[in-house]
């Protein structure tokens, strides 16, 4: 069937980086300059994506794969491929639809984007509060209240171990 | 690629508790919230709670605060959600998910689903 | 806590736009997420934060979210899109952080 579909279309041998000429009798051509053809048979070439602006180039255009896309410091990228770049905000505060804002008392944002998180409840798992929470960290908990009966030993509370961090887009 | 496993189907009797684990690959398991997830034949998703599997850190919602409890083994990259004193209207799929790496955003990757019954 | 009202279905022929809608109060000042369930099957997150798409999702499935209505649109519906849609958001202000709506059942004619 491959074989035979070949026969039929010459453009079918065209390979990626290439496109179908139907102006030059379908011969194959190199795509132009800032386009690109990933898969083989085509009959254009894709314009190159541009990173402009707040976006800026993660990976260049080739003749057979387009440009990628990150977005420069201070913001961080949403949707399939980095399509929109969204403003970081500090930690300790959420973005809001009118900009950053401070996380109210009892949540946290311990990264530079999405939205403050409830401190642990450590009672609801039997434990106690070893270290307080803040706006940019959640509260440690401890051992149960029981544990710490007195003789009981002291207990150093840990660093603050890295919290949970971002996808990679 | 990232990947979450969960345990196979229980059958339980009122009263009796059941845990379900859901084992993680193809990231780092302590960098992502894990959430629980559960829906009832018939029903819609309902949210049960998350762990932060870096620390511990729990968070349960309300409904179920005093009969659930989600812990973690980071040595083998599992989550496990135990719910105790099963009702039949516990009879659920149970599903964990994990959190993109910060929190409001959605859940992007899931379980294929624990089936729970709960029958005398 | 925060509710999420969705209609119980939407029915649309092939190759027409179905618009799914998720009611809460100024749902437009929170993110939105929608999930697409089949049977046997988990959820795919479909949309998040209001209006972008996972890597996969067709272009032609969007999302927005103003006031107090949030919407979820495909457009030349496919059968392949029969299935459950749950709007959901995140509520640290309450004691139940996560919220779904109560899902809307497309229904390809």
């Known amino acids: 069937f491959e074989r035979t579909r070949s026969l039929q279309d010459p453009c079918s041998n065209c390979p990626a980086g290439t496109f179908c000429d139907n102006n030059r009798n379908q011969i194959c051509s190199p795509c132009p300059p800032n386009s690109f053809s990933s898969a083989g048979g085509q009959r254009t070439c894709d314009i190159c994506r541009q990173c402009k602006g707040v976006f800026r180039t993660r990976k260049e255009c080739s003749s057979t794969s387009n440009a990628e896309c990150d977005c420069t410091p201070g913001f961080h990228c949403l949707g399939a491929g980095c399509s929109m770049c969204e403003q970081d905000c500090k930690q300790g505060q959420e973005l809001t639809k009118k900009g950053c804002k401070d996380c109210c008392f009892g949540t946290f944002n311990d990264q530079k984007r999405g939205i403050c998180r409830p401190w642990t409840n450590c009672s609801l798992d039997g434990k106690s509060v070893l270290v307080n929470g803040t706006k940019e960290r959640d509260v440690v908990c401890g051992p149960s209240p029981a544990d710490l009966s007195p003789g009981a030993s002291s207990v150093t509370p840990p660093a603050p171990a890295r919290e949970p961090g971002h996808s990679p887009q | 690629q990232v990947q979450l496993v969960q345990s196979g189907a229980e059958v339980k009797k009122p009263g009796a508790s059941v845990k379900v684990s859901c084992k993680a690959s193809?990231?780092?398991?302590?960098?992502?919230?894990m959430h629980w997830v559960r829906q009832a034949p018939g029903q819609g998703l309902e949210w049960m709670g998350w762990?932060?599997?870096?620390?511990?850190?729990?968070n349960y919602a309300q409904k179920f605060q005093g009969r659930v409890t989600m812990t973690r083994d980071t040595s083998i990259s599992t989550a496990y959600m135990e719910l105790s004193r099963l009702r039949s209207d516990d009879t659920a799929v149970y599903y964990c998910?994990?959190?993109?790496?910060?929190?409001?955003?959605?859940?992007?990757?899931w379980g294929q689903g624990t089936l729970v019954t709960v029958s005398s | 806590s925060y509710v999420l009202t969705q209609p119980p279905s939407v029915s649309v022929a092939p190759g027409e736009t179905a618009r799914i809608t998720c009611g809460g109060d100024?749902?437009?000042?929170?993110?939105v997420h929608w999930y697409q369930k089949k049977p046997d099957q988990a959820p795919v997150l479909v949309v998040y934060?209001?209006?972008y798409r996972p890597s996969g999702i067709p272009e032609r499935i969007s999302g927005s979210n103003s006031g107090n209505t949030a919407t979820l649109t495909l457009s030349r519906v496919e059968a392949g899109d029969e299935a459950d849609y749950y709007c959901?958001?995140?509520?640290?202000?309450?004691?139940?952080?996560?919220?779904f709506g109560g899902g809307t059942q497309l229904i390809i004619l």
């Open positions: 998910a994990r959190e993109p790496g910060y929190y409001g955003s959605g859940l992007d990757y």
């Open positions: 193809g990231y780092t398991f302590t960098g992502y919230y």
């Open positions: 762990i932060n599997p870096n620390s511990g850190g729990t």
């Open positions: 100024d749902i437009g000042d929170k993110r």
């Open positions: 934060e209001d209006r």
């Open positions: 959901q958001v995140w509520d640290s202000s309450s004691d139940h952080p996560g919220v």
